[in-house]
Interface confidence: medium
């Protein structure tokens, strides 16, 4: 039901007297313009808001490393650098490393160099600005980057290819596998480790040298950023001469 | 080995102060948030009033905003709640806790100071 | 502010049994609901945090679940020294708001 011009309220007996002329709402009074608040919206300043933390998931994977983590988070006034912190597992708190802000969010970056497994569990983002404090817990898994247990088999070789079994499983480490690399060189050149990307446990390297030793091994790259995980157990093998059968 | 200690309880008159002190040990004082919160006899627990002495921030639930002043004195480790205008309704034992992470879970608790108003 | 709802208030179990408790937000608050024990005349302990995390110490009997505004808690065979009143409370914003407690009771 509504009231007369100018009253609010549960009975319409609150009279609004806006100070610039804003709109009477029958239900909170006064719509103060931006910049201005207070029941007739005589005060300037932009009511404080307590802080929300957004665009966090509740789970997150991460590969051993270098992880990254971001924290961002609204509220008036915007929270600063030092009101965003993060927190392990083991209480341990951390600032962020990098900060900016736009008109409605401030970012904070953190950065752990090294992230391992035992730093597996409830992660914290926590904000704490004037306008109220906020949390938002949230768990991460770290994985474990995958390894060959094995070097590559050499099934068959000619004078300028070689047939490989890459002998990916079994591995060290976590799965899912999302690709696999075959690593080559010959033992004997300075050249840099080449690369072919291999879908199939059977492989055929072509283009080899005739009469040169090759070392070969896998690496095993699982999902998410920095998922290559160290190359696998090293296997020597020898080109034929040309010529011979 | 973390404690909280609280001291200051005891009967005060209707508008009447009282001052109560959490003496904080065992761990990093400045890297925490310490809360109060209260229990009306045979009622739930209601949180009171926080602050963070990192930076001095403080907080405050309705019901005692006003008339509670929450501080800390990081050079003794101690956090204070003063209350004034005191009413009937503020009868509760008092407790203070910590969080180490500045936020709202409270994983130490003092053992509580009792706070009667009464004529 | 956010309400939080438990329930039951209170509960009549024996020892040995599996007992769970409830507790409703009134908005969404993520997964910052912790869980805390408390005896007569002594001060709550902490059991749960992040809804599903048991805090160090607890006994595996214990445990949390939920997100968003629906939680729970279970105690998995009820010991004698678990007859208590047990608190929700969310840490997700400012103010911090307590249920009104469980109080489980031997049958």
């Known amino acids: 039901e509504a009231c007369h011009p100018g009253f609010y309220g549960p009975d319409c007996k609150l009279r609004c007297s806006c100070n610039n002329g804003e709109m009477c709402d029958r239900f909170q009074g006064c719509l103060c313009s931006p910049g201005w608040q207070g029941l007739q919206c005589e005060r300037e300043g932009i009511q404080r808001m307590t802080p929300k933390i957004v665009d966090l998931p509740d789970h997150i994977e991460v590969n051993s490393g270098k992880f990254n983590p971001i924290c961002k988070a609204s509220g008036w006034p915007l929270p600063t650098n030092e009101e965003m912190t993060l927190v392990k597992p083991d209480g341990t708190v951390l600032h962020p490393k990098d900060f900016n802000h736009t008109d409605h969010f401030s970012v904070a970056i953190f950065t752990i160099h090294r992230i391992l497994p035992p730093d597996s569990g409830v992660w914290v983002c926590s904000v704490n600005t004037v306008a109220g404090m906020v949390e938002k817990p949230f768990n991460i898994s770290v994985k474990v980057l995958p390894k060959p247990l094995n070097a590559p088999n050499v099934i068959d070789t000619g004078h300028n290819f070689a047939v490989i079994n890459i002998s990916s499983e079994p591995y060290f480490g976590d799965g899912p596998i999302k690709s696999k690399k075959l690593l080559y060189k010959p033992v004997n050149h300075y050249e840099a480790w080449q690369h072919i990307q291999v879908t199939n446990e059977i492989v055929t390297l072509n283009y080899l040298e005739p009469r040169t030793e090759y070392e070969l091994c896998v690496q095993l790259v699982r999902r998410g950023e920095g998922g290559e995980g160290h190359p696998g157990p090293v296997r020597r093998f020898t080109t034929a001469s040309i010529g011979l059968p | 080995e973390v404690q909280l200690v609280e001291s200051g309880g005891g009967l005060v008159q209707p508008g009447g102060s009282l001052r109560l002190s959490c003496a904080a040990s065992g761990f990093t004082f400045s890297n925490s948030a310490i809360h109060w919160v209260r229990q009306a006899p045979g009622k739930g627990l209601e949180w009171v009033a926080s602050i963070t002495p990192y930076n001095g921030y403080t907080y405050y639930a309705d019901s005692v905003k006003g008339r509670f002043t929450i501080s800390a004195d990081t050079s003794k480790n101690t956090a204070y709640l003063q209350m004034n205008s005191l009413r009937a309704e503020d009868t509760a034992v008092y407790y203070c806790?910590?969080?180490?992470?500045?936020?709202?879970?409270?994983?130490?608790w003092g053992q509580g100071t009792l706070v009667t108003v009464s004529s | 502010d956010i309400q939080m709802t438990q329930s039951p208030s209170s509960l009549s179990a024996s020892v040995g049994d599996r007992v769970t408790i409830t507790c409703r937000a009134s908005q969404d608050v993520s997964t910052a609901v912790a869980w805390y024990q408390q005896k007569p005349g002594k001060a709550p302990k902490l059991l749960i945090y992040s809804a599903s995390f048991l805090y160090s110490g607890v006994p595996s009997r214990f445990s949390g679940s939920g997100s968003g505004t629906d939680f729970t808690l279970t105690i998995s065979s009820l010991q004698p020294e678990d007859f208590a009143t047990y608190y929700c409370q969310q840490s997700y914003t400012t103010p911090p708001t307590f249920g009104q407690g469980t109080k489980v009771e031997i049958k």
């Open positions: 806790a910590r969080r180490q992470s500045y936020s709202y879970v409270m994983d130490y």
